[in-house]
Interface confidence: low
């Protein structure tokens, strides 16, 4: 039902859903700190623009009695319960920040009259694509899919001279929330990725994955998986791997590859790591000192959600426009705003654009090196290392099907 918004007369409120079920197991206190740091910045920016208004956040906690799995499995009802709580208290802000789980976002979007914007740190799944009042500040599955298709088709680089059209996808059901939806998108038979590939098989058992590594009858040399190097090691160990196997390890929200003095373990030599170009201002900020690299991205998304709201509020106030209108609710897209860590670009559907980075392990230095970058905004790949010191033959990525074409 329609809830009146605390969003006028110089006082603007942000409703922040503090859900027990979250895309990342982050103490809610850290997210509060992130939101509060964002509020300080927004207040300063509005003041500098000569806009004498009040901006606050209301943190809406669920009781946690029923929906306490801690992950996203029971988030659907928790999100709706929180909305009911907001409705009963008549305390809806100008914007809703959270939820982060795909299930809850999808259901909340369906079950509410969305005359206000929703900003999510997560909601990675394809079911949350193309939602008119939803903004997602962490790379959704669609962006990953577009990179993979672009990379598979690329055949004009010194280190990749073959188009690929096949892949195995390893998905065993124990994945984190982001990985679950990324792999789900690749598995879906109607997705862009599946449509563009000629062969794709999902490996669901550890043994299936392990067998493929040396199987002479395998249908593809390329295996996509999602997680960190430790996850790969648990699965692969020190097993021998055929020389033309390429493992693509999707590990978007992990800065560890960029830290000083990081050496790539030997089991990573057949692996290309797909991650995001890191930011750094959070390293010294008050709320992030104790955060892991992944959690830093999650907290940053909450903070940037606040900054995005401040950006839009400033524009609408300067233009003398009303905040509680569908126009405002639909405005959080197709723009660039000043995020905490530099400019943040949102695409036509309100999804964050980013620079994805494909890393390889140099056989000379045992360091992670950048092979190429990919700009999700323009769907374009930019080669970086034209002479990579690969483990693969002739310093080129192999064909995806053994024995097809010159090796």
């Amino acid at each position: 039902s329609q809830v009146s918004q605390n969003c006028h007369n110089g006082s603007y409120e942000i409703s922040v859903l503090m859900m027990g079920n979250s895309a990342f197991a982050e103490p809610l206190k850290n997210l509060e700190d992130a939101v509060n740091e964002g509020l300080e910045i927004v207040r300063g920016r509005l003041q500098n623009a000569g806009l004498n208004v009040t901006v606050n956040a209301t943190f809406m906690y669920s009781d946690g009695l029923i929906h306490n799995s801690g992950d996203c499995r029971s988030s659907t009802c928790e999100g709706l319960d929180l909305l009911r709580k907001i409705s009963n208290a008549q305390r809806m802000g100008c914007v809703l920040i959270g939820p982060s789980c795909t299930y809850s976002t999808f259901q909340m979007y369906l079950d509410t009259e969305l005359s206000y914007p929703m900003i999510s740190a997560g909601s990675f799944g394809l079911s949350c694509d193309y939602k008119e009042t939803l903004t997602r500040l962490m790379s959704p599955a669609r962006k990953l899919m577009y990179f993979l298709v672009n990379f598979w088709k690329t055949n004009d680089l010194p280190f990749k001279t073959y188009s690929w059209s096949t892949s195995y996808v390893y998905k065993n059901g124990t994945e984190t929330e982001d990985c679950f939806w990324y792999l789900n998108a690749l598995e879906a038979s109607v997705s862009y990725f599946s449509h563009e590939l000629g062969f794709k098989v999902v490996l669901r058992q550890d043994k299936e994955f392990q067998d493929i590594l040396m199987d002479h009858n395998r249908k593809s040399n390329v295996i996509i998986m999602c997680g960190g190097p430790e996850f790969l090691y648990k699965l692969k160990g020190d097993r021998a791997v055929a020389e033309d196997i390429v493992i693509i390890l999707v590990d978007l929200f992990n800065d560890q590859y960029f830290e000083d003095n990081v050496t790539a373990p030997d089991y990573m030599k057949n692996v290309l790591v797909l991650t995001l170009s890191p930011g750094n201002s959070l390293l010294n900020s008050s709320f992030s000192r104790n955060l892991s690299p992944t959690k830093r991205d999650f907290a940053l998304a909450y903070l940037n959600g606040i900054l995005l709201f401040g950006h839009m509020l400033k524009i609408f106030l300067e233009n003398g426009e009303n905040i509680t209108t569908p126009k405002f609710a639909h405005a959080f897209r197709n723009l660039t705003f000043e995020g905490y860590d530099g400019p943040v670009t949102l695409d036509d559907w309100g999804d964050v654009d980013s620079t994805m980075v494909l890393l390889y392990t140099s056989v000379d230095t045992k360091k992670y090196k950048v092979l190429l970058t990919y700009d999700t905004h323009v769907n374009k790949t930019y080669p970086v290392d034209m002479s990579p010191t690969f483990t693969w033959k002739n310093s080129k990525l192999p064909n995806d099907i053994t024995g097809r074409g010159p090796q």
């Epitope: 590859y257 960029f258 830290e259 000083d260 170009s277 890191p278 930011g279 750094n280 201002s281 390293l283 860590d341 530099g342 400019p343 620079t355 980075v357 890393l359 360091k367 992670y368 090196k369 950048v370 092979l371 930019y382 080669p383 970086v384 290392d385 990579p388």
Partner: nanobody, 133 residues
């Protein structure tokens, strides 16, 4: 190799302003950031200001609040607006482009003028700035 050409230097009184420009041409696909450095005779080249590909600026403490670095990616040009110039700003100013394939180079902290290792950097020829009291 990237070709960098600086312009805009000259002589100015203390408290005055200058705007330096740097036009870049050639392959820039591996750029991490661009920046301005300066050097006085007998001293090491020091970082003044840098800006990442996404537009994140960093400044040496000695110029913070007085100098502003900016870029026009469409024109492939880097700028340094210098206000409140002091005699100690007198130096040869160089434009630089930082490039590397190492993952760590993508880290914006590496692009801070105080922390910038000078491997993988293309330099311009420099433009002289003289500030008299």
């Amino acid at each position: 190799q990237v070709h960098l050409v600086e312009s805009g230097g000259g002589s100015v009184q203390s408290g005055g302003s200058l705007r330096l420009s740097c036009a870049a041409s050639g392959y820039t696909g591996r750029r991490l950031c661009r920046g301005w450095f300066r050097q006085t005779p007998g001293k090491e080249r020091e970082g003044v200001a840098t800006i990442t590909l996404s537009g994140r600026a960093s400044y040496a403490d000695s110029v913070k609040g007085r100098f502003t670095i900016s870029q026009d990616n469409a024109k492939n040009t880097l700028y340094l607006q210098m206000n409140g110039l002091k005699p100690e700003d007198t130096a040869m100013y160089f434009c630089a482009e930082v490039r590397s394939a190492d993952a760590e180079w993508l880290n914006p902290l590496k692009c801070h003028p105080d922390r910038l290792g000078l491997a993988g950097v293309d330099w311009g020829q420099g433009t002289q700035v003289t500030v008299s009291s």
